[in-house]
Interface confidence: medium
């Protein structure tokens, strides 16, 4: 009912070896089970977490401690709702060589969301 799924940012360019945090806002579900997808395949073996903003508003994070070339690609998040799979807009993650100055297109982060994770 009135599910909103938003991924951010639309494009993110980072230097190799730097950390990256993607987030996904889900509204209209009490307990979403957010899945992250990269280039069409569900992301496995990566740490992710939810933060409950309110009962029907959750933020999902996908965090990488140290980005390598293999991490570049098109990411989106998805949730199951009433048997339907809802997907967010994609986020393009591109890399520049280590030490280069990357132009970051960051989604605004509320400080309360900046919490520890495991993936670098």
């Amino acid at each position: 009912a009135g599910l909103k799924l938003m991924g951010a940012p639309v494009k993110l360019t980072v230097s190799q070896g730097q950390p990256v945090k993607l987030n996904c806002s889900v509204e209209g579900m009490e307990e979403p089970d957010i899945q992250w997808v990269k280039d069409g395949a569900v992301v496995q073996n990566l740490d992710q977490l939810y933060i409950p903003v309110s009962e029907q508003h959750w933020i999902g994070f996908l965090s990488l401690k140290s980005v390598e070339r293999s991490d570049a690609g098109r990411y989106w998040c998805q949730v199951e709702d009433g048997g339907e799979t809802e997907i967010s807009q994609p986020v393009w993650l591109t890399l520049v060589p280590r030490g280069s100055s990357a132009h970051h297109h960051h989604h605004h982060h509320h400080s309360a969301w900046s919490h520890p994770q495991f993936e670098k």
Partner: antibody
Framework: EVQLVQSGADVKKPGASLTISCQAS????????ISWVRQKPGKGLEWMGR????????MYGPSFQGHVTISADRSTATAYLQWRSLEASDTAMYYC??????????????????WGPGTLVTVSS | SYELTQPPSVSVSPGQTARITCSGD??????AYWYQQKSGQAPVLVIY???KRVSGIPERFSGSSSGTMATLTISGAQVEDEADYYC???????????FGGGTKLTVL
């Protein structure tokens, strides 16, 4: 104020069954993971596993998979750690820990801030 | 199963710098966390995400990570810092969590 109240110390014989509990208060029980950590006398910390109470999603450390069962009762905001058959090597202090953030199923980070006082389990013939 | 390796003990004199290391194959891609446990007490988190100090923890505590090694540094160790210190991280596939074996810090 977040509180984790654990059941009292227990002494059991090898082969006995046991369930220890961890009752949570001061927050929404279903929004957070509860983990269990073992510490044998004079030894280090060992991560046993955890549960997301709302969906009963569990994860176990390799050393504990199949030997213990972690469960939760949403109606009483209580998490449990259960053994079907205790061994002398299970003698330890067991801490329940609330993770800092609500987290999704699968592979999850934990930022341990709230620890229970511990339950001492002694297994001896 | 995945392991994090720490030295069993580290000794320093008061005011000296103590360094406690933690080695693990997944640490290039996984964050390390550090806990302090004083005798008879529950552990307390001091450092998270390799190098971030928890609010209320003295500035003399710092963390770093390079390659497969994470390090907890206590600059100007005090007698009250005597405790067991544990690193904590995730397995390579993220499916479970692991504590290091612990390091007993003695401040003589």
């Amino acid at each position: 104020e977040v509180q984790l109240v654990q059941s009292g110390a227990d002494v059991k014989k090898p082969g006995a069954s046991l369930t220890i509990s961890c009752q949570a208060s001061g927050y929404t029980f279903t929004d957070y993971w509860i983990s269990w950590v073992r510490q044998k006398p004079g030894k280090g910390l060992e991560w046993m596993g955890r549960i997301r109470p709302l969906l009963s999603h569990t994860m176990y450390g390799p050393s504990f998979q199949g030997h213990v069962t972690i469960s939760a009762d949403r109606s009483t905001a209580t998490a449990y750690l259960q053994w079907r058959s205790l061994e002398a090597s299970d003698t330890a202090m067991y801490y329940c820990v609330r993770s800092w953030l609500a987290t999704s199923g699968g592979t999850i980070p934990e930022y341990y801030q709230h620890w229970g006082p511990g339950t001492l389990v002694t297994v001896s013939s | 199963s995945y392991e994090l390796t720490q030295p069993p003990s580290v000794s320093v004199s008061p005011g000296q710098t103590a360094r406690i290391t933690c080695s693990g194959d997944a640490l290039p891609k996984k964050y390390a966390y550090w806990y302090q446990q004083k005798s008879g007490q529950a552990p307390v988190l001091v450092i998270y995400e390799d190098a971030k100090r928890v609010s209320g923890i003295p500035e003399r505590f710092s963390g770093s990570s390079s390659g497969t090694m994470a390090t907890l540094t206590i600059s100007g160790a005090q007698v009250e810092d005597e405790a067991d210190y544990y690193c904590y991280s995730a397995s390579a596939n993220g499916n479970y969590r692991v504590f290091g074996g612990g390091t007993k810090l003695t401040v003589l």
